[in-house]
């Protein structure tokens, strides 16, 4: 039975040209995290594998930095980066947990972080 929950940074906004940390946290389970995939729709951004470390997609290799932790730092933001991001936790023995973050990249200097929220 899957008992865990994913906590994410929720809806967030950031300035064009700036950077943002995409962060998820898996709680309420003793399952072992074997891999975390970061995706935008069906496109891979990066993978953090427990044994092999980080792999950054070619499309993002020049502006994605691994971490902090299992999170991802997205740099040199453009308005095209606006959209949904998913953290996909591969765990044993539970299976897969998915968290969602919505990022809005703003032209102006007004960019506020949304509240944290949980996805069961």
């Amino acid at each position: 039975m899957m008992t865990g929950t994913i906590e994410t940074t929720g809806n967030i906004s950031a300035e064009k040209g700036g950077s943002i940390i995409l962060q998820c946290h898996l709680s309420s389970t003793t399952a072992q995290v074997t891999q975390v995939n970061w995706e935008q729709q069906d496109q891979l951004l990066a993978i953090c594998n427990a044994d092999l470390g980080w792999h950054i997609s070619p499309s993002f290799k020049d502006r994605v930095a691994p971490g902090p932790g299992l999170g991802l730092t997205l740099q040199s933001l453009t308005v095209n980066d606006t959209g949904e991001y998913f953290c996909i936790y591969h765990t044993y023995p539970d299976g897969t947990y998915t968290g969602r973050i919505f990022l809005e990249v703003l032209e102006s200097s007004v960019a506020e972080h949304g509240a944290r929220f949980q996805i069961p």
Epitope: T34, Q35, I47, N49, D51, H55, P58, K61
Partner: antibody
């Protein structure tokens, strides 16, 4: 030594499905992506997509989404590509290749190729 | 998608010649370019990665260079076993794309 041994050529009817295999030997299967590449006669290769065998994470060239499906069997160190709803456009040589996990963006060993002929 | 163009589809040269094969990208690819050799029997081998890094086991007569959108593969002293088709491939972003190939023949 590193080897990627592909299944033999296939002759299939339009509308059918085919599954091509790629058996890896001489290295740690889970430490490398398996890449799939299509080559029609007289044309340059086309990248279909990739699978990370350890987790089964698969990513596709948008052009081949819905056409190709990747799987991998860690116990036999074998990757598979299924092609569905075959048409004459799918007649080609299909290659598997490996790409090291991490920030290594080249295909350093290739299979010998599998020739697929789709004909009524 | 980024288009890779190899304008010379076939090339004839003599043994011992210095041969240069060119490849251009539809936009800048920041040296994110690989070269592969495909023998007449279909066997594919990686020659060069990241524009100019020689893959292990590849003879030193092969070299690569370029920047921006224009790249080249040079064979300094053509040998009989170099008869093959050569493909460039970028990895600036997904999807990876390949050039149409340059077939090298002996005069």
């Amino acid at each position: 030594q590193v080897q990627l041994e592909q299944s033999g050529g296939e002759v299939m009817k339009p509308g059918a499905s085919v599954k091509i295999s790629c058996k890896a030997t001489g290295y740690t299967f889970s430490n490398y992506w398996i890449e799939w590449v299509k080559q029609r006669p007289g044309h340059g290769p086309e990248w279909i997509g990739e699978i990370l065998p350890g987790s089964g994470s698969a990513y596709y060239n948008e052009k081949f989404r819905g056409k190709a499906t990747f799987t991998a069997d860690k116990s036999s160190n074998t990757a598979y590509m299924q092609l569905s709803s075959l048409t004459s456009e799918d007649s080609a040589v299909y290659y598997c290749a490996r790409q090291k996990y991490g920030n290594y963006y080249y295909f350093d060993y290739w299979g010998q190729g599998t020739t697929l002929t789709v004909s009524s | 998608d980024i288009q890779m163009t190899q304008t010379t589809s076939s090339l004839s040269a003599s043994l011992g010649d210095r041969v240069t094969i060119s490849c251009s990208a539809s936009q800048g690819i920041s040296n994110y370019l690989n070269w592969y050799q495909q023998k007449p029997d279909g066997t594919v081998t990686l020659l060069i990665y990241y524009t100019s890094s020689l893959h292990s086991g590849v003879p030193s007569r092969f070299s690569g260079s370029g920047s921006g959108t224009d790249y080249s593969l040079t064979i300094s002293n053509l040998e009989p076993e170099d008869i093959a088709t050569y493909y460039c491939q970028h990895y600036s972003k997904l999807p990876y794309t390949f050039g149409g190939g340059t077939k090298l023949e002996i005069k």
